[in-house]
């Protein structure tokens, strides 16, 4: 005799499967506030959408536990090295998790890189990071995009830095 | 009394997560035809392969609506920066989706990079862009490769450059 | 009349789905052993975990035959261009299979970067390069990440360098 | 091909409440945004703010916050907009169009609201 | 966020060109490539023309062409013919998930 209990968790695993957690958020001029918080992001327009997760403040908010790839891409850019970007100092491009039980957020995946060549240097450069791996999050975990030096970051379209998830 | 229909559509379920659609192609010699077209891809042989998607000149095409995760990666390289490629003029790498009802080329995700330094150097170089997020396709629907700057991706025995999908 | 085969297909199905298999791995001050074999990793601690795959000397092990996505992500750093790394010699990163049927490792995601500028410079640098892409792989296989030179190689709490998969 | 097909015209009190259906076809419905317009007699357009088909995520124009629920039944690809407490200054023509990336493509062809008392 | 700005009416004679402007800030029409454009006859419902600042739908005549320069983007409509004569409005996204509409131009073909 089949257990009822079974067949609805069946049914449901079907209808989730359906739906399961996906997001792609988009950058827009709005992303970057310089204000040192995380990169906002574009949610609902262009090729942004939310499915079984939240947005809150820039970050993806988790609804279900689960193990999630998690990625970004940002797109630098500048003329020579601005001020401040001494030739030892990277851009530093990560993923980081907003969790309730630790105050600060936890690193998940973070890339350094020397994009602009030598300070002397007055030429336009341009690169591109991504980031892209497998975390655990608990429901109601959030994660959010940082770039230390947010003045870098350039925005157009949403198709050149991005945001995004979904559940393995 | 369990519905036939829903018995069915979890067996169909079952079945299509085994062949949930997928894909990955690679770089071939003829991979870039100097055209200014899209870039062609290996779709049988090696580790290329095609699983509930479809291909054509260049493009993944898909046969069922959904989100899917399209990749790609080039292999760029050249000897000092090669005519044309000004020091401000970086090098463009996208993901493309070609639609009926909006015949010109609509961009997903798209990234620049300034490989090459410095246009007097004659030192060779190399460099690699990845790209990687989350979409969604109608049935039918194309996306496409393209390095504006063709000349400059490297192609080797398929693991160079690459160009991939999957149903999330 | 429903066939209890089928059923039990379905329940395990829905089991497999919730553990599909899945895992990342990160790096630690004993990635790199300078022996010249593939990198090593931790796989339980911190960030790192297992489900439905295996590990062995440097090589996630798969347990069942299927499409798999892998990536790593490895964050390089250096002064200057060490020696050996002539100017036109680049990094290479890879991800290469191991299987019983052949002795050699194959080929499978292959980046190559020219990270460090001109060998001549004394400035510090930073660059990192991802791979991801979907593969088959039969139950025992392995896979592992390699970086020729992987003096380069810069480990830090586990979110700069790392290597992951999951079944598509 | 993609359609929308929009309920027939209305004629309501001063007052009262209005609920607009939108049908569409032709595409997958859950996977875009539908957004409604409106257009005062001899007035331009008027965006009133959509609703996300697939998380049911909404955004309103400012002016009409409180007034407005937009709404989707996925099961019949058939989305909503409720404008309470019509003023005659309602009086328009109500469109409701797919949100396709950053354009409005395709409309319905109009409902008439018609606000007298 | 007001409105974008259009020209009340612009005419033309057939056979001629004629360029509708649209004018907004750096945070929209300025700020991204988003600008979308929709012809809208008497007594009918709206129709997409361009869209992406200078991209036409299938079926569109490609005598309608958009561009965009700083903050103002244009509509161009050349050869132009009485079947053009109609309402025209442009669109731009302005972040944070707003869109916004321009007044409207009325196009009267002489």
């Known amino acids: 005799d089949q257990d009822t209990g079974s067949w609805e968790q069946l049914v449901q695993a079907r209808r989730s499967h359906k739906a399961s957690p996906a997001a792609h958020l988009t950058g827009a001029n709005s992303s970057s506030m310089g204000t040192g918080g995380p990169l906002l992001w574009e949610t609902q327009l262009g090729l942004a959408f939310l499915r079984g997760l939240g947005y809150h403040d820039g970050a993806l908010v988790t609804t279900q536990a689960g193990y999630y790839y998690i990625y970004s891409k940002v797109q630098l850019g500048g003329v020579g090295c601005p001020q401040g970007l001494a030739t030892d100092l990277p851009v530093t491009h990560g993923l980081y998790k907003r969790t309730t039980r630790y105050p600060e957020e936890l690193e998940l995946l973070v890339s350094r890189r020397s994009p602009c060549g030598r300070a002397a240097s007055s030429r336009v450069w341009w690169d591109s990071s991504f980031l892209g791996g497998v975390v655990h999050l608990e429901a109601g975990e959030e994660v959010v995009v940082r770039v230390l030096e947010e003045q870098l970051v350039r925005l157009r379209d949403g198709t050149r830095s991005y945001f995004g998830a979904f559940m393995v | 009394d369990q519905d036939t229909g829903s018995w069915e559509q979890l067996v169909q379920a079952r079945r299509s997560h085994k062949a949930s659609p997928a894909a990955h192609l690679t770089g071939a010699n003829s991979s870039s035809m100097g055209t200014g077209g899209p870039l062609l891809w290996e779709t049988q042989l090696g580790l290329a392969f095609l699983r509930g998607l479809g291909y054509h000149d260049g493009a993944l095409v898909t046969t069922q609506a959904g989100y899917y995760y399209i990749y790609s990666k080039v292999q760029l390289g050249g000897v000092g920066c090669p005519q044309g490629l000004a020091t401000d003029l970086p090098v463009t790498h996208g993901l493309y989706k070609r639609t009926t009802r909006y015949p010109e080329e609509l961009e997903l995700l798209v990234s620049r990079r300034s490989p090459c330094g410095r246009a007097a150097s004659s030192r060779v170089w190399w460099d690699s862009s990845f790209l990687g997020g989350v979409v969604h396709l109608e049935a039918g629907e194309e996306v496409v490769v393209r390095v504006l700057e063709e000349q400059l991706v490297r192609l080797r025995d398929g693991t160079r450059s690459y160009f991939g999908a999957f149903m999330v | 009349d429903q066939d209890t085969g089928s059923w039990e297909q379905l329940v395990q199905a829905r089991r497999s789905h919730k553990a599909s298999p899945a895992a990342h791995l990160t790096g630690a001050n004993s990635s790199s052993m300078g022996t010249g074999g593939p990198l090593l990793w931790e796989t339980q601690l911190g960030l790192a975990f297992l489900r439905g795959l295996g590990y062995h000397d440097g090589a996630l092990v798969t347990t069942q035959a299927g499409y798999y996505y892998i990536y790593s992500k490895v964050q390089l750093g250096g002064v200057g261009c060490p020696q050996g790394l002539a100017t036109d010699l680049p990094v290479t990163h890879g991800l290469y299979k191991r299987t019983t049927r052949y002795p050699e490792e194959l080929e499978l995601l292959v980046s190559r970067r020219s990270p460090c500028g001109r060998a001549a410079s004394s400035r510090v640098w930073w660059d990192s390069s991802f791979l991801g892409g979907v593969v088959h792989l039969e139950a025992g296989e392995e896979v592992v990440v390699r970086v020729l030179e992987e003096q380069l190689v810069r480990l830090r709490d586990g979110t700069r360098s790392y290597f992951g998969a999951f079944m598509v | 091909q993609v359609q929308l097909v929009q309920s027939g015209a209305e004629v309501k009190k001063p007052g009262a409440s209005v609920k607009v259906s939108c049908k569409a076809s032709?595409?997958?419905?859950?996977?875009?945004?539908i957004s409604w317009v409106r257009q005062a007699p001899g007035q331009g357009l008027e965006w009133m703010g959509w609703?996300?088909?697939?998380?049911?995520?909404?955004n309103y124009a400012q002016k009409l916050q409180g007034r407005v629920t937009m709404t989707t039944d996925t099961s019949t690809s058939t989305a909503y907009m409720e404008l309470r407490s019509l003023r005659s200054d309602d009086t328009a023509m109500y469109y409701c169009?797919?949100?396709?990336?950053?354009?409005?493509?395709?409309w319905g062809q109009g409902t008439l609201v018609t606000v007298s008392s | 966020q007001s409105a974008l700005t259009q020209p009340a009416s612009v005419s033309g004679s057939p056979g001629q060109s004629i360029t509708i402007s649209c004018t907004g800030t750096?945070?929209?029409?300025?700020?991204?490539?988003?600008v979308s454009w929709y012809q809208q006859h008497p007594g009918k419902a709206p129709k997409l023309m361009i869209y992406?600042?200078?991209k036409r739908p299938s079926g569109v005549s490609n005598r309608f062409s958009g561009s965009k320069s700083g903050n103002t983007a244009s509509l161009t409509i050349s050869g132009l013919q009485a079947e053009d004569e109609a309402d025209y409005y442009c669109?731009?996204?302005?972040?944070?998930?707003?869109?916004?509409f321009g007044g409207g131009t009325k196009l009267t073909v002489l």
């Open positions: 169009a797919r949100l396709y990336r950053n354009w409005f493509d395709p």
């Open positions: 032709g595409y997958t419905f859950t996977s875009y945004g």
């Open positions: 609703i996300s088909a697939h998380n049911a995520n909404t």
């Open positions: 750096s945070s929209d029409v300025g700020g991204y490539n988003y």
């Open positions: 992406d600042v200078s």
């Open positions: 669109c731009s996204y302005a972040g944070s998930s707003t869109l916004l």
